[in-house]
């Protein structure tokens, strides 16, 4: 008897972080033997949607014409072949931005920082939130969470970086969200450009979790160091 069918691949275009009102297409790619594709959404009745395969039958398209809160969440897909249903795909987390007003991102003491010194990125919201995310453009692992403990809500979070190296330079944005859905984020803050000077010979900071050996410098997760702020927020890596 043959082993289980290989799991399909699930992805979203143009990406998995979508602004409210924009369109998104979810793709599920299986094998040429696929007869039907099924998309399941966590905490929704299954199946969430079914589609016939597109020629040459190795994938299916699930369209979301206008992103809203209802579509944000965690998805998996399956395909059916003559021998049965496949294993589930790895999950796809579809995140909607624009659920809350944009936070403000500031650099303390300045966005111009000398290599080896310290800088703190400060993300501040108008309303009390329990999760703050710092995102660096063009990073493969861009999400750094500060999440409040015990359900306490905060108006700000500090992301300290010390010592700063060339890797920290770049464009940052922050988001805020509520604990009841980590798939709903605020509008992004205005971008903040962190410029690191005197950093040509800086050593690369060593990440505290493993990443693909094929990863280049921009694929490393951002690694602020220093104590967790006094605000009752806890640091999480995504």
């Amino acid at each position: 008897q043959a082993g289980p069918l290989p799991k399909p691949t699930l992805w979203a275009e143009p990406g998995s972080v979508i602004s409210w009102g924009n369109s998104v297409t979810i793709w599920c790619q299986g094998t040429l033997e696929a007869r039907e594709y099924r998309l399941d959404k966590e905490e929704s009745p299954a199946p969430w949607d079914r589609q016939n395969p597109l020629e040459p039958k190795n994938k299916a398209r699930f369209s979301i014409p206008s992103m809203t809160e209802d579509y944000a969440g965690r998805y998996r897909c399956y395909y059916r072949s003559p021998v049965g249903w496949s294993q589930p795909s790895d999950p796809l987390e579809l995140v909607m931005t624009g659920a809350y007003s944009k936070p403000t991102l500031s650099a303390l003491p300045s966005p111009l920082v000398t290599s080896g010194k310290s800088v703190t990125l400060l993300c501040q919201s108008r309303s009390p939130m329990d999760t703050f995310l710092l995102i660096k453009e063009r990073a493969a692992h861009p999400l750094l969470h500060l999440r409040s403990e015990h359900g306490a809500q905060q108006h700000q979070a500090e992301f300290p970086m010390s010592p700063v190296t060339s890797v920290h330079g770049g464009t940052y944005r922050c988001f805020s969200s509520h604990g009841f859905s980590h798939y709903l984020l605020s509008h992004p803050s205005d971008p903040l450009e962190l410029i690191v000077s005197g950093s040509l010979e800086d050593p690369r900071p060593s990440p505290t979790r493993s990443v693909s050996t094929a990863a280049g410098p921009e694929d490393q997760p951002l690694m602020p160091t220093g104590s967790v702020p006094h605000s009752g927020l806890r640091r999480h890596w995504e």
Epitope: P103, S106, L108, S125, R126, S127
Partner: antibody
Framework: QVQLQQSGAELMKPGASVKISCKAT????????IEWVKQRPGHGLEWIGE????????HFNENFKDKATFTADTSSNAAYMQLSSLTSEDSAVYYC???????????WGQGTTLTVSS | DIQMTQSPSSLSVSLGGKVTITCKAS??????IGWYQRKPGKGPRLLIH???TLQSGIPSRFSGSGSGRDYSLSISNLEPEDIATYYC?????????FGGGTKLEIK
């Protein structure tokens, strides 16, 4: 606990300048905006502007742009507001206030009474 | 600028009773409103923010509600220490603005 201690009452002559201080304790001074608010009898509370001590960024109410200057010293956890070219219209109680993120104003100083009189 | 119209400007109250103070914004402020209590010789004290979130240490007899342009602060079971002047603050806009105040007096 969070406290904002303001400098004492001032009696100034028209045309002079005055610098009001606000000493903060009980929290990380550099990461919270300090707001300045004016209260004149019959005029209610009026927002003058704000400073983020950690980087010196400021925002102003247009009505006070040429009147007020904000500074902060993170080594002593103190914020300052200087008012220039004083007139009788500047006679008021001035408050420094900590702001929660970009949200509400939470902790207020006790107020500094400024009287401008010849 | 967003104008905040607070009413009434003064109110005679009975201890043990309930009062409601209202603030009307000149435009939608998305629930970004705080309520403050001020006593003579002291700085104002934050009671409620984000329309209905009670600030730590504030008794539950204070409550806030509202949406869009219309907001209110209610105080039930009035106690002697509640006699003060109350203000609303909108912080939806880069230029925060206050209501004109409501002075509570004992009947």
């Amino acid at each position: 606990q969070v406290q904002l201690q303001q400098s004492g009452a001032e009696l100034m002559k028209p045309g002079a300048s005055v610098k009001i201080s606000c000493k903060a304790t009980g929290y990380t001074f550099r990461t919270y905006w300090i707001e300045w608010v004016k209260q004149r009898p019959g005029h209610g509370l009026e927002w003058i502007g704000e400073i983020l001590p950690g980087n010196g960024n400021t925002h102003f109410n247009e009505n006070f742009k040429d009147k007020a200057t904000f500074t902060a010293d993170t080594s002593s956890n103190a914020a300052y507001m200087q008012l220039s070219s004083l007139t009788s219209e500047d006679s008021a109680v001035y408050y420094c206030v900590r702001r929660l993120g970009r949200g509400p104003f939470d902790f207020w100083g006790q107020g500094t009474t400024l009287t401008v009189s010849s | 600028d967003i104008q905040m119209t607070q009413s009434p400007s003064s109110l005679s109250v009975s201890l043990g009773g309930k009062v409601t103070i209202t603030c009307k914004a000149s435009q939608d402020i998305n629930e970004y409103i705080g309520w403050y209590q001020r006593k003579p010789g002291k700085g104002p004290r934050l009671l409620i923010h984000y329309t209905s979130t009670l600030q730590s240490g504030i008794p539950s007899r204070f409550s806030g509600s509202g949406s869009g342009r219309d907001y209110s602060l209610s105080i039930s079971n009035l106690e002697p220490e509640d006699i003060a002047t109350y203000y609303c603050l909108q912080y939806a806009n880069p230029l925060p603005t206050f209501g004109g105040g409501t002075k509570l007096e004992i009947k």
